[in-house]
């Protein structure tokens, strides 16, 4: 903390301008009025203060606003935002998307910091849901943002926001997250025609149930192997050989290269070897001819 000393004669700041960058830390403390600083925050960001100097300015703002900064100040923090702790940010009430964008811009190109994570959390909680504009903004700055949310948090994403999601935004999502996002995507894209619908829904299919995969197999979609490998194993297992063939179209040949990996491996184990042979891919491990398959889970349900 800077020792409080009287401001030297003629050095009292009447406005926030470039001359202040040459003030020593104690002079900034003594000669810059906190209220002046708050009203001219837009100028602060235009002056390349050192972080040591920004510490002094932050201290002044903290004294002026012990309960948290107003949005008029927050919007113009610039590099000063990097000096904020998550505890500081928890005191804020950020409602403007412009404010959010301005602060994310400061951190652009870097991994999401605890400060940014706290800011986003405050913003989204304040809005009550992840609306399309917010999601658009967040995924533009952090493509992996969506997959950093818990399934519970994702449940607040309205289906209309799904239009903002790009395939790369879902790269790191796990099946639990896709389970929540898939029904929303299905609802969002429901009025699209077959081929257009598949292009949009494809990235979300890791959350699709068996019946939807069966329906897709009737639409000549030609799913690629990368998408197939991300499907839920429990959703793939009940599909017949004919359905998988229709689902993959010309990509069905790729099954051979993936026969030892889930979900292909588990699916093969559930198919009759006869049926697998019809593919002509040399897939092995199916149920030998003449064997009877008992579905024990069904039997338990009946008893």
């Amino acid at each position: 903390e800077v020792e409080k000393t009287a401001c030297p004669s003629g050095k009292k700041a009447r406005e926030i301008d470039e001359s202040l960058i040459f003030y020593k830390k104690w002079e900034l403390e003594a000669c810059v009025d906190a209220a002046l600083l708050a009203t001219q925050m837009d100028r602060v960001n235009a002056i390349p203060f050192t972080y040591e100097q920004l510490d002094v300015l932050k201290h002044k703002l903290d004294e002026l606003y012990p309960q948290g900064y107003p949005e008029s100040v927050i919007q113009h923090l610039g590099y000063l935002f990097l000096k904020m702790s998550p505890e500081d940010i928890r005191k804020w009430n950020v409602t403007s998307l412009e404010t959010l964008k301005a602060l994310l811009e400061v951190n652009k190109g870097h991994e999401m910091s605890p400060q940014v994570a706290t800011l986003i959390d405050r913003f989204v909680k304040g809005r009550g849901q992840l609306d399309k504009d917010t999601l658009d903004t967040l995924t533009a700055f952090y493509p992996g943002y969506l997959c950093s949310l818990s399934p519970e948090e994702l449940s607040s994403v309205p289906p209309s926001s799904i239009w903002a999601v790009r395939p790369q935004d879902l790269d790191t999502c796990d099946p639990r997250q896709l389970d929540v996002l898939y029904p929303k995507a299905r609802l969002a894209f429901q009025n699209m025609n077959g081929s257009e619908y598949f292009v949009k829904i494809q990235s979300f299919l890791g959350g699709a149930p068996t019946e939807d995969l069966k329906a897709l197999s009737q639409q000549n979609v030609s799913m690629d192997l990368a998408t197939f490998m991300k499907l839920r194993t429990d959703a793939v297992l009940p599909l017949t050989v004919a359905e998988v063939q229709k689902l993959l179209g010309p990509h069905v040949e790729g099954l051979k290269a993936e026969e030892r990996h889930r979900p292909v491996r588990d699916w093969i184990l559930r198919q009759r070897q006869d049926d697998l042979d019809t593919l002509g891919l040399g897939l092995q491990g199916g149920i030998p001819n003449g064997y009877l398959v008992l579905d024990l889970s069904m039997q338990e349900a009946l008893s």
């Epitope: 390349p48 050192t50 972080y51 920004l54 590099y79 990097l82 400061v106 190109g109 870097h110």
Partner: nanobody, 117 residues
């Protein structure tokens, strides 16, 4: 992080010139502004000049018209050209940088400038 090495200091007569260099290494892509400071014996450190990544620069009133700061982004180097040197310019000159990724100033070890009368 960013590492800084200053050079170019030395002993010079009043009225003479020196050119200081500050070479940055490490995560140089995150450097925003480069600064020259100085600290004379028994005095506080003071900012002498700065130059931003966009080329905006300024120098303190005490050295205006005598010192100029420049920067070569390709070489990650800042220069301080010091002309018409005075004995009161004697100090250790330090380079520092502000980065966009980490909210602390990174500093060099300093280079001694001595101006004799």
């Amino acid at each position: 992080q960013v590492q800084l090495v200053e050079s170019g200091g030395g002993l010079v007569q009043a009225g003479g010139s020196l050119r200081l260099s500050c070479v940055a290494s490490g995560r140089t892509s995150t450097i925003d502004t480069m600064y020259w400071h100085r600290q004379a014996p028994g005095n506080e450190r003071e900012l002498v000049a700065y130059v931003t990544s966009r080329g905006t620069s300024n120098v303190a009133d005490s050295v205006k018209g005598r010192f100029t700061i420049s920067r070569d982004n390709a070489k990650n180097t800042a220069y301080l050209q010091m002309n018409s040197l005075k004995p009161e310019d004697t100090a250790v000159y330090y380079c520092s940088v502000r980065t966009t990724s980490y909210p602390v100033d990174f500093w060099g070890q300093g280079t001694q400038v001595t101006v004799s009368s």
